[in-house]
């Protein structure tokens, strides 16, 4: 017997949509051969109607897709728009057609159930309005209208023209008789529940000379959207709930095994701890859509998710819902990468983050979630140079190593530093990344001095001291800039004496500006690296004054653990604020992006063995 | 909560049909799966059919191999109650027939037991002659 398996039969009406679900053994073989959706024949031929290879029959063309899912071992057919001439015998499938693995399903796509003459179906989403319309006669228009709802063999009044309105429809409902000449009054539904469902009779007048009118209301559960996303990776629920909610609050939530649904985040100002430093919800557009992006995915956020709109900011019974069921796929194509990089108050982190390597050409882009309200992420600095003014001299976003990763260089760190960062480009929406950066006890590994003051034309000596642990490593003085940090030449001047209990592999590397220049002055980085993949650094600032004495300055290392004194930056911080994001030059697909925090992980010279997830920068 | 009630065991000789039912009651869901599991005696919990269905009137109904063409899943018009129409049975039918649900569609196989919530006590069916 085959070990594919799926729905042996699926009935279902014209004009409507099937997704049939077929379950493989998701074997490594089986996850990635060709599956397939054919028709059987009378001569027992199975035509291919649509497969993963992308083959769309004419058809089928534009109402039918198939979507493997590896990492569940099923495949789903979609197929939109049946007619009767869909029903007939089926195969789905994986390999060739006549000798794969298969399953046999029957479709059978019926007519719909008989209505009365003339009509009128409806056919509206739950938590919608629908406005139904009663024509009616001129001898009829000054008697009462009336939508009545028919349950069996009786017919139930809903609301009529002289005030009456059924409890059930209390608050949502109203009855509009348009103004002489019009011969049509409309009902309308606000906040459709699936009660509503059934059979409407529309009244004018009454006895023999009445008017009627038929309508057939179908209110529809939304059928979860199939979203499948990489570990680690992101996902966007893109939400669009219409223009009668545009003002009420809205709310993303996740079924439970209750069958309740758990708000995620809301515009009310509630999140889950559960998504802290990985969600944000897009400000709505003047239509009452937004959108909620989640970074870092866990294989635990697994489920399905809605979202809605009302005051309370959580799922009620009646407002409009948009539904997604998430899957998030294992075989993640998107790095392991630390989600926690450790620092220490003085030092540095380098954080690794990962990008499309196909879109090697994408800007590149750092920002600090912040979750105040919905969440937003203003941008610290990006690969074109801009950085905050705050964060000048402290912060590099480097292209190296490539091929798929950048790296992000912060020194300087101080408890404020602690918190989420989110790593994205304006390519590839699914690789956002997250990054928690914690500030932890310990002493900087490099030791650099304080602020160091140059004298015009005269040679300035400024000392690096590198511990034992690092002698391995690349060593390099470099001049940081907003486009990033021009690497200088140095000089290794042998051990050094900062560092006691500790072998010849302790270095000290100087760096020397002769003669020093107006040019000269701004912020000096040391650090470590391994090929392209940077360490820790350490940063100096050199202010450059008028010569006073004659002779040359060289800054002792007995000064070299001083601490640095704080650059006094210009107050007015530029801000980049979420409008920013939302410029389509940034995100070629999604205005979203700006409000999304981004975090970014640190990778740093030292790291923590306790866990794979966490990098560590503190001193052994 | 869902509560699920089976009735419609019994005791049939073999080649004899019989009628199961499983009435939900509770909060009711427009989208559903509902399925049958079997246990004979001694045995592991099996699969036996499964339902599912949109709120738009679209089916799809499941078989395990030993019962295609002899059972016949099926849903009534009060949308409340699942039958499974048993034809042609054999002693290897015997066993307590469980009924199950899931109100949020199935996503994963719907042969398995983990896709369902809710649960009924079970209708002991017994074939012999």
């Known amino acids: 017997k085959s070990p594919v398996f799926g729905p042996q039969e699926v009935s279902s009406v014209e004009g409507n949509s099937v997704s049939i679900k077929c379950y493989y053994p998701p074997t490594s073989v089986n996850r990635h051969t060709r599956k397939y959706w054919c028709r059987k024949g009378a001569s027992g031929r199975c035509i291919t109607l649509v497969s993963s290879e992308g083959y769309v029959s004419s058809n089928y063309a534009g109402r039918a897709n198939l979507t493997n899912f590896p990492e569940n071992g099923t495949f789903v057919v979609n197929i939109a728009q049946l007619s009767r001439d869909d029903s007939g015998h089926y195969k789905c499938g994986l390999g060739i057609n006549s000798r794969g693995l298969s399953f046999d399903v029957s479709l059978e796509v019926s007519q719909g159930p008989e209505l009365p003459n003339g009509t009128e179906v409806y056919t509206v989403d739950v938590g919608r309005t629908v406005t139904i319309k009663c024509p009616f006669k001129t001898e009829n228009a000054p008697k009462t209208k009336a939508l009545y709802k028919k349950i069996g063999q009786t017919s139930v009044l809903v609301i009529d023209s002289r005030n009456y309105v059924n409890p059930n429809y209390k608050d949502r409902i109203r009855l509009r008789i348009p103004g002489t000449g019009q011969l049509i009054f409309t009902v309308v539904i606000d906040r459709l529940r699936l009660s509503d469902h059934g059979l409407y009779l529309c009244q004018a007048g009454d006895g023999s000379n009445r008017d009627e009118k038929n309508a057939d209301l179908q209110v529809l559960e939304p059928e979860p959207e199939l979203v499948y996303e990489d570990l680690r990776g992101s996902v966007t629920f893109h939400c669009a709930l219409g223009l009668e909610v545009a003002n009420v609050a809205k709310f993303l939530c996740r079924v439970n095994s209750r069958e309740t649904c758990d708000v995620v985040i809301n515009t009310l100002g509630k999140r889950d701890s559960a998504f802290e430093g990985r969600i944000l919800l897009n400000p709505q557009d003047k239509d009452g859509s937004f959108s909620v992006v989640i970074t870092g995915l866990r294989k635990e956020d697994e489920g399905r998710y809605l979202c809605g709109a009302h005051s309370d900011g959580q799922l009620q019974e009646g407002w409009p819902i948009q539904a997604w069921q998430l899957f998030v796929n294992e075989e993640s194509t998107i790095p392991r990468s630390p989600t926690v990089v450790k620092g220490v108050a003085g030092g540095s982190v380098a954080v690794l983050c990962p990008y499309n390597p196909k879109e090697s050409q994408s800007l590149k882009y750092w920002c600090l979630w912040e979750g105040a309200q919905n969440g937003r992420c203003p941008l610290l600095v990006e690969s074109q140079g801009l950085v905050q003014e705050q964060y000048e001299g402290r912060l590099s976003l480097l292209q190296e190593p490539g091929n798929g990763t950048f790296t992000v260089i912060l020194n300087q760190l101080t408890t404020q530093d602690a918190g989420f960062y989110w790593c994205l480009t304006n390519g590839d929406t699914r690789w956002r990344t997250t990054v928690e950066i914690k500030i932890i006890e310990g002493e900087p590994n490099l030791k650099v001095p304080g602020n160091v003051t140059a004298v015009l034309g005269e040679t300035l000596n400024i000392p690096c001291h590198f511990p034992c642990k690092f002698s391995s490593y690349e060593k390099y003085w470099c001049k940081w800039s907003n486009t990033g940090c021009q690497t200088l030449p140095s000089q290794d001047e042998g051990p050094s004496e900062a560092f006691v209990n500790c072998d010849e592999n302790s270095r000290l590397v100087s760096l020397t500006l002769n003669p020093v220049t107006r040019a000269d002055e701004g912020w000096y980085w040391c650090g470590v690296k391994q090929g392209h993949f940077y360490g820790e650094t350490a940063a100096v600032y050199v202010a450059v004054e008028e010569k006073k004495v004659a002779g040359s300055r060289y800054v002792s290392p007995a000064k070299a653990d001083a601490a640095p004194d704080e650059k006094v930056l210009d107050s007015g911080v530029r801000e980049i604020e979420n409008k920013a994001i939302q410029d389509p030059r940034l995100f070629a697909e999604e205005k979203v992006v700006a409000d999304t925090g981004d975090q970014a992980g640190g990778s740093r010279a030292s790291v923590d063995s306790s866990s794979s997830e966490e990098q560590g920068g503190s001193s052994k | 909560e869902v509560q699920l009630v089976e009735s419609g065991g019994g005791l049939v000789q073999p080649g004899g049909s019989l009628r199961l039912s499983c009435a939900a009651s509770?909060?009711?869901?427009?989208?559903?799966?509902m399925g049958w599991f079997r246990q004979a005696p001694g045995e592991e919990r099996e699969f036996v059919s499964a339902?599912?269905?949109?709120?738009?009137?679209?089916?799809?109904?499941y078989y395990t191999d030993t019962v295609k063409g002899r059972f016949t899943i099926s849903r009534d018009n009060a949308e409340t109650t699942v039958h499974l129409q048993m034809n042609s049975l054999k002693p290897e039918d015997t066993a307590v027939y469980y009924c199950?649900?899931?109100?949020?569609?199935?996503?994963?196989?719907?042969?398995?037991?983990?896709?369902?919530?809710?649960w009924g006590q079970g209708t002991l069916v017994t074939v012999s002659s």
């Open positions: 339902i599912s269905w949109s709120s738009d009137g679209t089916y799809y109904k």
């Open positions: 509770g909060r009711t869901f427009s989208s559903y799966t």
């Open positions: 199950a649900a899931s109100s949020s569609g199935t996503y994963g196989d719907p042969r398995s037991e983990r896709e369902y919530r809710y």
